[in-house]
């Protein structure tokens, strides 16, 4: 038997992936565990093997179909179970009725690129990945710019309260190396959270022209 507190948290990427993390205080030595998903009314079910990410937590991804296929809807309820092998049988360690569109975490934005760069300005665009058509335009973004001599944690957050897949960064220093990241969040869902940050995009502002103020 396993004692201690257990936490089972899952997020839906809005298309065909449910990512889960299971934390268990009591030690589980060399035990095989998995997450099993049973949606109401749908014929399919899916399983993934929990793999350790730290001493007391395990994670796995339920791949429900092709990356851009819409496998679940706003009315779906999925029974998620953590099952661990005990001898010849499986024991239910955690269970939840999972409402996918109340627990959203999208994929990080992709395809970041510099559209136009000047001495003090830079226009950057990106794309969202594997996001449901259900959202229409109901998304928001956060962006941050890494300046020389600072950390990402120190970077001020720029909030875009609409589905706007570009930004114009102002008041930059000429001939300076920067990095830029963006993340996305649907407006829908009680337990919805921000996507991971995108891969950083490195760019350099243009040098100031001699004798001119650009």
């Amino acid at each position: 038997a396993v004692n201690g507190t257990s936490q089972f948290t899952c997020f839906y990427n809005s298309r065909a992936n449910i990512s889960c993390v299971w934390s268990q205080d009591g030690a589980l030595q060399d035990t095989s565990c998995q997450v099993h998903a049973w949606p109401d009314r749908r014929r399919w079910n899916q399983t993934c093997e929990l793999l350790p990410v730290s001493q007391a937590s395990w994670a796995c991804n339920l791949i429900l179909g092709a990356p851009d296929s819409q496998k679940l809807t706003t009315v779906d309820i999925v029974t998620l179970r953590v099952l661990c092998r005990e001898g010849v049988r499986w024991r239910v360690m955690a269970i939840q009725d999972f409402k996918p569109f109340e627990n959203l975490r999208l994929m990080a934005p992709i395809s970041l690129q510099v559209v136009h760069v000047e001495t003090h300005r830079c226009n950057i665009s990106w794309e969202i990945s594997q996001a449901s058509h259900y959202f229409e335009r109901h998304l928001e973004f956060e962006a941050r710019t890494l300046s020389p001599g600072h950390t990402w944690e120190e970077a001020p957050l720029l909030t875009l309260k609409q589905k706007q897949e570009w930004i114009c960064l102002e008041t930059l220093t000429p001939d300076t190396q920067y990095e830029f990241q963006v993340r996305v969040k649907p407006l829908q869902g009680e337990f919805t959270t921000w996507s991971p940050w995108s891969q950083p995009l490195a760019f350099r502002t243009k040098p100031a022209a001699l004798g001119k103020d650009t």
């Epitope: 109401d40 009314r41 749908r42 014929r43 399919w44 809807t73 009315v75 309820i77």
Partner: antibody, heavy 118, light 111 residues
Framework: QVQLQQWGAGLLKPSETLSLTCAVY????????WSWIRQPPGKGLEWIGE???????NYNPSLKSRVTISVDTSKNQFSLELSSVTAADTAVYYC????????????WGQGTLVTVSS | NFMLTQPHSVSESPGKTVTISCTGS????????VQWYQQRPGSAPTTVIY?????PSGVPDRFSGSVDSSSNSASLTISGLKTEDEADYYC??????????FGGGTKLTVL
Amino acid sequence: QVQLQQWGAGLLKPSETLSLTCAVYGGSFSGYYWSWIRQPPGKGLEWIGEINHSGSTNYNPSLKSRVTISVDTSKNQFSLELSSVTAADTAVYYCARADRRFGELRYWGQGTLVTVSS
Amino acid sequence: NFMLTQPHSVSESPGKTVTISCTGSSGSIASSYVQWYQQRPGSAPTTVIYADNQRPSGVPDRFSGSVDSSSNSASLTISGLKTEDEADYYCQSFDSSLYMIFGGGTKLTVL
């Protein structure tokens, strides 16, 4: 033994609101979907919508703008409201319990004939 | 829109076997489970088959169900027909948005 008993007004005028209630006796109220289905005279079955014990609803798109299904878990009851009725809404209305896993309607109310006439 | 199409009526003699089809219009009928209901005049429907091929207790084994994903259809087969089997039969499933869908119904006449 699970039983569903339904009641509500049987005669309405056009533009009025249809209101029906279904009481569930025996069995668990949570863990199921609670549905409304109708059947016009001499015709087939039409799903109106459903609600689960936590209050999440799903409605037939063709009726969605006029339908409200609500639940009172303390009384083991759920209700249907259909606004702006016309003669085309004349039908026998059934409440039913739908299984979570498969969506089977195992238990049905006795049915209420609702007639819309001026 | 996903629709389930059934023959309007079928008829057969007592003791014979009859099959009622239920064909999906688009998408896959195999993405959700299929139920079959029997409805006699003046009564609420009752389940004869659920989850494609399962019989509730009390339903005779003369009733069987199947789903064929290649033809995007489900079938209800009644063998050893009896006069008491005369009724309307409805298939039921879900579309991809989990809207419950009924077939138009099939009137079974036992000659």
